[in-house]
Interface confidence: low
């Protein structure tokens, strides 16, 4: 049977909160019958578990088998090419997949206008796969922070950045009118996780939203 097939050049995780996807690059000159076998190792249980015998895609959703990621020492994954009776050597992820590798996201951002202020509320992610007790705020229970980027339309497209330590934030518009667009990027001050910018949410501010106080 040999190992004439080349190995997948690289294997890596791309993960968000309870959305843990393993990716790999295809072998060169793969045929229509080439598929990929995926195995998973949990740190502390030093044996590989076969997860998929023959995936023809270049990614595999491992969320269901890594639900304890946030309470474990992490995982390694490996992938090899299979074509009929031939198979390649394994390619192993070159870093441990742990909570540190999870890219932080927000669920959504809601904006309201109150008397010249924009009040924002950050909704935390609520993935369907997450066990009931594993909420974003229970796993990242301290030092949650959010970078806020504000863009004024019309305008010269310059962004105002500020950092807040709360899922609610207040932006004073200084009496300006127009469309204000807001993006949010989460982080946790005590951790090194990357954060992803949310999609832009916009709200229009017109004169009717201002009340004059003496």
């Amino acid at each position: 049977h040999g190992t004439e097939l080349p190995s997948p050049p690289s294997v890596w995780f791309e993960a968000e909160f309870f959305h843990h996807i393993l990716h790999w690059t295809p072998i060169p000159n793969q045929s229509e019958s080439t598929c990929y076998e995926v195995a998973l190792l949990r740190y502390g249980i030093e044996s590989w578990n076969s997860i998929s015998n023959c995936s023809q895609t270049l990614s595999y959703d491992l969320t269901a088998v890594t639900l304890d990621l946030y309470h474990s020492n992490g995982y390694r994954a490996r992938v090899r090419a299979v074509d009929g009776s031939r198979h390649s050597n394994w390619t192993v992820t070159n870093t441990r997949f742990s909570v540190d590798e999870v890219t932080l996201t927000v669920g959504s951002v809601n904006l309201e206008i109150h008397n010249g202020f924009i009040l924002g509320k950050i909704q935390l992610p609520r993935p369907k796969m997450a066990p009931a007790n594993d909420t974003y705020e229970s796993i990242f229970s301290h030092f949650r922070e959010y970078e806020i980027a504000i863009r004024k339309v019309p305008g010269n497209f310059t962004f105002t950045h500020k950092k807040v330590k709360h899922e609610n934030f207040s932006l004073l518009t200084s009496g300006e009118v127009g469309e204000f667009c807001v993006q949010v990027k989460p982080s946790v001050a005590s951790r090194s996780n990357k954060g992803m910018w949310s999609k832009e949410e916009c709200i229009s501010l017109t004169r009717q939203y201002f009340t004059v106080t003496n």
Epitope: N115, F169, S170, L172, G175, F210
Partner: nanobody
Framework: QVQLQESGGGSVQAGGSLRLSCVAS????????MAWFRQSPGKEREAVAV????????LYTDSVKGRFTISQDNAKMTVYLQMNRLKSEDTAMYYC??????????????????WGQGTQVTVSS
């Protein structure tokens, strides 16, 4: 000296009115935001109203909208809270607060740096 001094609290029947005053030192009156918070026994301190002193823009918590008005008198370096149609659930110690600049949520007590000693408001039904 950095200080905030509240006055105007007292006892009133439900449906009545009170006006609270908060006199600030010059340094504090030049802050960006001043606010009234309240705290009743066994509960967390909650924001009632916030004013942005540079423009007079105001924010109110839902439970007091239409009943309470926050305002300022720049000459007297004073912020007021006019409380009308008072209810028994408005009974609390009322505190004046100020912060020079904040990137945090304005209805969060932790966002504010400077606090007065408080004035008691009791509404009886």
């Amino acid at each position: 000296q950095v200080q905030l001094q509240e006055s105007g609290g007292g006892s009133v029947q439900a449906g009545g009115s009170l006006r609270l005053s908060c006199v600030a030192s010059r340094y504090l009156y030049s802050t960006n935001y001043m606010a009234w918070f309240r705290q009743s026994p066994g509960k967390e301190r909650e924001a009632v109203a916030v004013i942005y002193t540079a423009s007079g823009a105001t924010l109110y918590t839902d439970s007091v909208k239409g009943r309470f008005t926050i305002s300022q008198d720049n000459a007297k370096m004073t912020v007021y809270l006019q409380m009308n149609r008072l209810k028994s659930e408005d009974t609390a110690m009322y505190y004046c607060a100020a912060v020079r600049k904040t990137d945090s949520y304005l209805f969060d007590a932790q966002s504010f740096t400077y606090w007065g000693q408080g004035t008691q408001v009791t509404v009886s039904s």
